[in-house]
């Protein structure tokens, strides 16, 4: 819900970080929408899931995502780049056994079926924004965020702190 600092030199710290507990500190179902109130929806097509960003018709039910929050412990870092300590990480699962994954090679966001323990590609550092929106930074590729591109979710590189408030990487979570 709140202010973000800027893209820091997360690379080493994020790659070295470990999830401190196998259990999430909390998890709940929420619908995910963009800054411009478009809904994130999930559709099963040819035995795989597709992710869409679209305007829902009035009274159309929003898809829910299970968000699981984990505490990540970084190694101590005295370099002053703002990255050591405990961070809040999240996984997103729209349906049983499927999780959002960052495909860094293709710059895409995909749904993969997998078992626990989940791979690093399924974890995103949660950033709360001052506009009561959130953004999701790839654990495996610091400075890269889930964003909206051509009515799909994609991975978007954010290279300066000014760009952290760009609308295409901001998302809203709601109970309805």
């Amino acid at each position: 819900a709140f202010g973000i600092s800027g893209v820091q030199k997360y690379t080493r710290a994020l790659h070295d970080s470990s999830i401190t507990g196998i259990s999430p500190i909390t998890e709940y179902l929420a619908s995910l929408s963009t800054y411009n109130d478009q809904s994130i929806t999930f559709a099963l097509e040819d035995e795989s899931y597709e992710i869409y960003v679209e305007d829902l018709k009035k009274d159309e039910k929003k898809d829910k995502v299970l968000l699981s929050y984990y505490e990540s412990q970084h190694p101590s870092n005295e370099s002053g780049d703002g990255v050591d300590g405990k961070m809040l990480m999240v996984t997103l699962s729209p349906t049983k056994d499927f999780w959002l994954h960052a495909n860094n090679k293709e710059h895409s966001v995909e749904l993969h079926k997998c078992e626990k323990p989940l791979p690093d590609q399924a974890f995103f550092v949660l950033h709360n924004m001052h506009s009561n929106c959130v953004s999701f930074e790839c654990k495996t590729d610091p400075g890269v965020f889930i964003g909206v591109k051509d009515n799909h979710l994609a991975l978007i590189k954010v290279d300066s702190s000014e760009n952290l408030c760009t609308e295409n990487i901001l998302f809203k979570l709601s109970e309805t």
Partner: antibody, heavy 122, light 107 residues
């Protein structure tokens, strides 16, 4: 261990300003944000705003916007809260509190300063 | 702003009693709720974060539950050092807001 040590009590006249300090130790100061919370005598807690120690990014509660300034000095690991145009309603204990998580503000605190009593009286 | 309503505002109890304090948010806050204990002249101390997570070093007689709008802090067996004022705080959206407090007094 993590410690937040605040400056001593202040007595101010209405219309004056006060600047409270919060010296951090036991962790990398630039990794975490600091919030300021106040408590009037016999009353509840009120969040005033937040500062990111790393780059000075601030977010103030609307009630204090234009009257409060939060700053940090990374060379001394100290956060400051200045409140201007004081009136008797500002008589309170002012606390600094550290974010539980680094990297971004999530509104969760783990460590608090001991508090600074600011009395506004003519 | 999200209003946080705590009840009761005060409770008289004896050592060994089970004490329950509730906190209601004016709108859903998922699990983003913390509980604090405050003694006179002291800073608040975190007991529970994210609705149900016990802060390190806090005795296991304290527990938290709830999500959405309704939350509970339970002290399973009140100890002499537990007589204090307890506050809830929502961390879901700005501005952060606190409940009005519940004073736990000796019967």
């Amino acid at each position: 261990q993590v410690q937040l040590v605040q400056s001593g009590a202040e007595v101010k006249k209405p219309g004056a300003s006060v600047k409270v300090s919060c010296k951090a130790s036991g962790y990398t100061f630039t990794s975490y944000g600091i919030s300021w919370v106040r408590q009037a005598p016999g009353q509840g807690l009120e969040w005033m705003g937040w500062i990111r120690a790393y780059n000075g990014y601030t977010n103030y509660a609307q009630k204090f916007q234009g009257r409060v300034t939060m700053t940090t000095d990374t060379s001394t690991n100290t956060a400051y809260m200045e409140l201007r145009t004081l009136n008797s309603d500002d008589t309170a204990v002012y606390y600094c509190a550290r974010d539980r998580y680094s990297g971004s503000f999530h509104g969760n605190f783990d460590y608090w300063g001991q508090g600074t009593l600011v009395t506004v009286s003519s | 702003d999200i209003q946080m309503t705590q009840s009761p505002s005060s409770v008289s109890a004896s050592v060994g009693d089970r004490v329950t304090i509730t906190c209601r948010a004016s709108q859903g806050i998922f699990s983003w709720l913390a509980w604090y204990q405050q003694k006179p002249g002291k800073a608040p101390k975190v007991l529970i974060y994210a609705a149900s997570n016990l802060e390190s070093g806090v005795p296991s007689r304290f527990s938290g539950s709830g999500s959405g709008t309704d939350f509970t802090l339970t002290i399973s067996s009140l100890q002499p050092e537990d007589f204090a004022t307890y506050y809830c705080q929502q961390a879901n959206s700005l501005p952060l807001t606190f409940g009005g407090g519940t004073k736990v007094e000796i019967k």
